[in-house]
Interface confidence: low
């Protein structure tokens, strides 16, 4: 290997003494891991992000990097430290031979190493002649400032900042970290280089076709003239934003990442850190007609991930591909034939399509919401985006069958007004990854740090599951679902809510073995029931006769099969009131639903009696859905009888607080 930085002998001598003073060994029993992009063509071998353990100081990062250089030099390899990370993640970016990975993984403080990989702009086409009108523009809710209290960072291509649409609205930072363009005959043409970023800046804050016309933007160049960048370049860009935020704290920050690469642990980790520093990140779900969980930053739970729909509420098709989908998508937004600034001239407009355009819409909506309510947390903003979305308008037939239940049927919209949202009890449904089919496999669904887990349910397409339960993990409740022998796997489904000053706990009753079934209630003073879960160890929960009935006058209890343990989620929060609502169908039916009324929010969704022909229960917006096996396989026996149980809550405290504010 060669290195531009000088003579090999000199480097060895310089680093030999450095290494001698570094004798710390890696902590006993901990092994660092190596990660690389699952998509071979996107891999960039030879460049690696070495991520160090969380509490590592900058000085230790620098010493670890130098130590790697010294040890590599001893073995006859030259390495080049391209960047030392601090501010978001501790670590460094190194150019080296893959032969050195084993050595690098044994260095002190190393958590994991990730091979660099490519990321791509998520729009097509680059320059389109056909121009169509905006598919989406701000509805009647338009604060006079239109997002003026918010700064939106755009990590993208270079932009044409003197375009009439965005002139004076976008500050081009001096940040640039892009790979060389592919191909020897590539000619850099300013209008092509600026195309993607200029268009997106226009969609976010353009004078005519922008969503948040008052928002100011800052652009960082992380994509080259072909719309290609790297994970490492994006990481350094995110670090730049964090450092800017620390140096000069301003109002709310929104970061738009209209790009996607393969799943990246390090990119997701950086996004998580930035989100936890109070920054709202919005990203494209990806244009691969695939599960968004296979891409980054789309798969990062802390990021608001946006899929694309068209004016007919169809998921957007892009050539042979189209919008990504699945549980990692938070919501959809217009992403087909979106009008925005064209870099062909300072007054030109062009239409582009893709999840980048959809993400830009949501970044604009987020800027508007944050401008109206600057104190909103990321969790509050996400819940509001979901709450104000158009529900159940997307034609789900476009998605693969196994993804339909996991994909949110939500299209972003601006709230009708800035008032009236404060009293709402906001909840959302979070699906886990699939557990896999092994006998003891489990799946875990988690809420965001400032959300409360109010209920937990499970779902299996085969019906072979052993229920679910809420359990404490790292000081927070999580929802865990259990696969059963012969099952194809399960999903855990968490109902995550914003409930300030809540004190929640789980009360469990072991299997009763009595004919009346198992019951558990919220016995603490002032605690109300928000959700019921049941979990069983037996492989097949038999038909339960007599049927499980909820005793009258005891709404605050969960009931279930006598062979199952029952878990009640019990919460105390100012003004919280809940009620149980049931819908039973005596004859077998593939789907039974029950919805909460206007003003009430669904917090819990479960099935009675929970026998093996029930595939599971999950919440869709404010409706509890219980799915059963195909009617034809069940027969019209009493086993076919299923009841959907919804727990509906509201908060008088939040309502009062919002009235006092108005």
């Amino acid at each position: 290997q060669e290195d531009e930085d000088g003579d090999y002998e000199e480097l060895v001598l310089a680093l030999r003494s450095e290494e001698d003073g570094l004798a710390e060994a890696p902590e006993h029993g901990t092994t660092a891991t190596f990660h690389r992009c699952a998509k071979d063509p996107w891999r960039l071998p030879g460049t690696y992000v070495v991520v160090l353990k969380e509490e590592t100081h900058l000085s230790q990062s620098e010493r670890t990097a130098r130590r790697l250089q010294a040890q590599a030099a001893r073995r006859g390899y030259l390495t080049k430290i391209l960047h030392v990370f601090h501010g978001l993640l501790p670590g460094f970016l190194v150019k080296m031979s893959g032969d050195l990975l084993e050595l690098a993984l044994k260095l002190p403080h190393v958590d994991y190493i990730e091979e660099d990989s490519s990321v791509f702009a998520q729009s097509i086409p680059w320059n389109l002649e056909r121009i169509t009108p905006p598919r989406y523009r701000a509805d009647e809710y338009q604060p006079p400032d239109g997002g003026s209290l918010v700064e939106v960072y755009l990590l993208d291509t270079s932009i044409q900042s003197d375009h009439r649409e965005i002139e004076g609205r976008v500050m081009v930072t001096d940040f640039e970290n892009v790979p060389e363009e592919d191909g020897t005959r590539f000619h850099r043409q300013a209008s092509k280089c600026d195309s993607h970023g200029t268009h997106l800046a226009g969609v976010v804050s353009g004078r005519d076709a922008g969503v948040a016309k008052g928002a100011s933007m800052r652009s960082l160049r992380v994509l080259n003239c072909q719309g290609k960048g790297t994970v490492s370049g994006t990481l350094i860009g995110l670090e730049f934003i964090r450092k800017s935020q620390l140096v000069q704290p301003v109002g709310p920050l929104v970061v738009l990442l209209p790009l996607a690469g393969g799943y990246s642990r390090v990119l997701n980790a950086a996004c998580q850190r930035l989100a936890r520093a109070g920054v709202v990140l919005v990203t494209a779900a990806g244009n691969f007609r695939d599960d968004a969980c296979l891409y980054s930053p789309a798969s990062a739970p802390e990021v608001i991930t946006v899929g694309a729909t068209n004016a007919q509420d169809q998921p957007v098709t892009l050539g042979t591909l189209g919008t990504n989908f699945g549980r990692c998508v938070d919501l959809f937004a217009p992403g087909e034939d979106i009008i925005g600034a064209s870099s062909d001239c300072s007054t030109c407009f062009v239409s582009q399509s893709g999840t980048s355009q959809a993400a830009a819409h949501v970044a604009g909506i987020a800027a508007m919401m944050l401008s109206a309510e600057p104190e909103l947390t990321l969790a509050e903003l996400r819940q509001r985006l979901i709450h104000f979305s158009a529900k159940d308008v997307i034609n789900e037939a476009w998605f693969p069958e196994d993804q339909r239940v996991l994909t949110p049927n939500l299209v972003a919209a601006l709230p009708p007004s800035t008032h009236g949202a404060g009293w709402q009890l906001f909840c959302r449904t979070v699906w886990s990854a699939h557990s896999g089919p092994t006998r003891m496999a489990t799946a875990v669904a988690r809420c965001a740090p400032d959300e409360e887990l109010l209920s937990c349910s499970s779902f299996s397409r085969s019906g072979k599951r052993r229920g679910e339960r809420m359990e404490a993990q790292g000081g927070k409740l999580v929802c865990r679902a259990h696969n059963a022998f012969g099952g194809e796997g399960v999903y855990a489904i968490a109902r995550c809510c914003l409930l300030p000053q809540a004190n929640c706990s789980v009360h469990t009753a072991p299997p009763a073995e009595a004919s009346m079934g198992t019951r558990v209630h919220c016995h603490q003073q002032g605690h109300v029931l928000t959700g019921c879960s049941s979990h069983w160890e037996v492989e097949d929960l038999g038909t339960h006769k007599p049927p499980v009935l909820r005793p009258r006058g005891q709404p605050n209890q969960c009931v279930g099969h006598r062979e199952a343990s029952i878990h009640a989620s019990c919460c105390h929060a100012p003004g919280l009131e809940c009620k149980v609502k049931e819908h039973g169908i005596p004859a077998p039916q593939e789907q039974v639903t029950v919805a909460c009324e206007e003003g009430w929010t669904l917090t819990g969704c479960s099935a009675l009696p929970g026998t093996s022909h029930v595939l599971g229960a999950y919440a869709v917006d404010n409706t509890c859905v219980v799915r059963s096996r195909d009617v034809s396989t069940t027969g019209s026996t009493s086993e076919g009888a299923v009841t959907a149980v919804a727990i509906c809550c509201r908060s008088r405290h939040l309502a009062q607080a919002s009235q006092e504010l108005q």
Partner: antibody
Framework: EVQLVESGGGLVQPGGSLRLSCAAS????????MGWVRQAPGKGLEYIGI???????YYASWAKGRFTISRDNSKSTVYLQMNSLRAEDTATYFC?????????????????WGQGTLVTVSS | DIQMTQSPSTLSASVGDRVTITCQAS??????LAWYQQKPGKAPKLLIY???PLASGVPSRFSGSGSGTEFTLTISSLQPDDFATYYC??????????FGGGTKVEIK
């Protein structure tokens, strides 16, 4: 006072052409989409087409090819060029201004209308 | 092309009546629907846009509702000035602009 005034209507023979104008006063047309709508005697409203603020035009499928909308922002005027006219094109032609960008989700909700100009196609 | 179907085509009512006109779209148009009032020899007047918000200067006795394919215009208490023809109009993207056939509200 905000006003749209259509002109250029009249009697024309089948197969003939006519150019209607819509002049605006009291508003800057350049930042709005402008549409044309017609109404045959005793009948309902029929959408013809729209021109958005930065130039592109869109037409009802029946109007494509025969009707052309254009604008001259310096004169604050929008035009409707009608070719190969037929008897069934006899109608009052209205020009209308789109609701401002902040209020409607899509182009085509019209909140300011002209008084209309009558076009009669007859031999 | 999108089709907008209005019903009824004619409606006889008296002053003070509550009047409801419905409009059906041949495909989902979200809430991109407007309602207009037109009097003989006059240009149409925008009453409602985006399915429910009132255009400026429109009395509050007018209200609109619906989304997707089914929409309703309601006049809570018919006034003498309200006898006219009412049109619904879809504007869900440039290729989906179309008017309904109209509903004439006449004196009973």
């Amino acid at each position: 006072e905000v006003q749209l005034v259509e002109s250029g209507g009249g009697l024309v023979q089948p197969g003939g052409s006519l150019r209607l104008s819509c002049a605006a006063s009291g508003i800057d047309l350049s930042s709005y989409a402008m549409g044309w709508v017609r109404q045959a005697p005793g009948k309902g409203l029929e959408y013809i087409g729209i021109i958005v603020s930065y130039g592109p035009t869109y037409y009802a499928s029946w109007a494509k090819g025969r009707f052309t909308i254009s604008r001259d922002n310096s004169k604050s005027t929008v035009y409707l060029q009608m070719n190969s006219l037929r008897a069934e094109d006899t109608a009052t032609y209205f020009c209308a201004r789109d609701l401002d960008a902040q209020s409607s989700g899509y182009y085509g909700a019209f909140n300011i209308w002209g008084q209309g100009t009558l076009v009669t196609v007859s031999s | 092309d999108i089709q907008m179907t209005q019903s009824p085509s004619t409606l006889s009512a008296s002053v003070g009546d509550r009047v409801t006109i419905t409009c059906q779209a041949s495909q989902s148009i979200s809430t991109a629907l407007a309602w207009y009032q037109q009097k003989p020899g006059k240009a149409p007047k925008l009453l409602i846009y985006a399915a429910s918000p009132l255009a400026s200067g429109v009395p509050s006795r007018f209200s609109g509702s619906g989304s997707g394919t089914e929409f309703t215009l309601t006049i809570s208490s018919l006034q003498p000035d309200d006898f006219a023809t009412y049109y619904c109009q879809s504007y869900y993207g440039s290729s989906n602009i179309a008017f309904g056939g109209g509903t004439k509200v006449e004196i009973k």
